[in-house]
Amino acid sequence: NKILVKQSPMLVAYDNAVNLSCKYSYNLFSREFRASLHKGLDSAVEVCVVYGNYSQQLQVYSKTGFNCDGKLGNESVTFYLQNLYVNQTDIYFCKIEVMYPPPYLDNEKSNGTIIHVKGKHLCPSPLFPGPSKP
């Protein structure tokens, strides 16, 4: 038995920040689990980890230097990534492991989300032109 994961196909981080919601075919209420977000086609970089425990506060951390936070829903974990760089544009995969109570469950690999990080514009945007010359 595998948990199914749904993610948005693509997200654009205009302000170098993005909310990526991982929706699971499994209710996480009163479970102990480890949800994580991985970067790259080979999922080589573990961007952010959320440990959920029925009796404790959510633990959120990154061992790879990402600025991240996490929010828990009954059947979802939302990762909030900040201070992203343009060169961190990539595909990101949600992963979930439910440890307790047994049995252990993990997910089928999802399709992933392409996060496109737009750089901060140094020149005025066409929608908000600067003061016009007289």
């Epitope: 102990e32 480890r34 492991e97 440890m99 307790y100 109570p101 049995p103 252990y104 993990d106």
Partner: antibody, heavy 120, light 111 residues
């Protein structure tokens, strides 16, 4: 045949560190369906669970030891490791690795254990 | 953490006796109809050996004189006819929640 063999025990100074190994054979540490825990037993006392590692490499630790313990593995050697820091006399124990199945999490195979003595 | 309390802590019995050991959990260890409570036997200088898993299932190779019962918070290990090789210490263990915990043990001695 499934086998677990611990090594690395011995005399350690208080405040020091230990690194124990658990060589697994008869199954792969990286194959889904089984994980391995470390469990210890102080002389004349009961069994205490230290932590575990899943096939994915994810780890879970006892809250009372979490700040001092790291469980890792080397897939190429099919070997599990236990690192315990800031050792004190009460860490003196026989340390076991034990395999568990993913359905019931019962420990179906155990190593023979390795004795760690923390003393100056 | 889930506390497991075994009783008695020790007992003296003779070969052929029926022996019963109980294990009480501080909260239910049941989930979807399964009790995540297991029993182990340990002899001096040896590693523990799994006897019963999921409260009542006999581990492969374990003699049928060993049986387990119970659900929720109250569990029992029974040895129907004690044999010389059964003199040992018995532990219950829960795997319902982390951290996994063990009972303090019950030592079965020769009368």
């Amino acid at each position: 045949e499934v086998q677990l063999v611990e090594s690395g025990g011995g005399l350690v100074q208080p405040g020091g560190s230990l690194r124990l190994s658990c060589a697994a054979s008869g199954f792969s540490l990286s194959t889904s369906g089984v994980g391995v825990s470390w469990i210890r037993q102080a002389p004349g006392k009961g069994l205490e669970w230290i932590g575990e590692i899943y096939h994915s490499g994810s780890t879970y630790y006892s809250p009372s030891l979490k700040s001092r313990v790291t469980i890792s593995r080397d897939n190429s050697k099919n070997t599990l490791y236990l690192q315990l820091n800031s050792l004190r006399a009460e860490d003196t124990a026989v340390y076991y690795c034990a395999r568990y199945g993913y359905y019931y999490y019962d420990f179906d195979y155990w190593g023979q254990g390795t004795l760690v003595t923390v003393s100056s | 953490d889930i506390q497991l309390t075994q009783s008695p802590s020790s007992l003296s019995a003779s070969v052929g006796d029926r022996v019963t050991i109980t294990c009480r959990a501080s909260q239910s260890v049941d989930f979807h109809g399964i009790s995540f409570l297991h029993w182990y036997q340990q002899k001096p200088g040896k590693a523990p050996k799994l006897l019963i898993y999921a409260a009542s299932s006999l581990q492969s190779g374990v003699p049928s004189r060993f049986s387990g019962s119970g659900s929720g918070t109250d569990f029992t290990l029974t040895i129907s006819s004690l044999q010389p090789e059964d003199f040992a210490t018995y532990y219950c263990q829960q795997s319902y929640r982390s951290p996994r915990t063990f009972g303090q043990g019950t030592k079965v001695e020769i009368k």
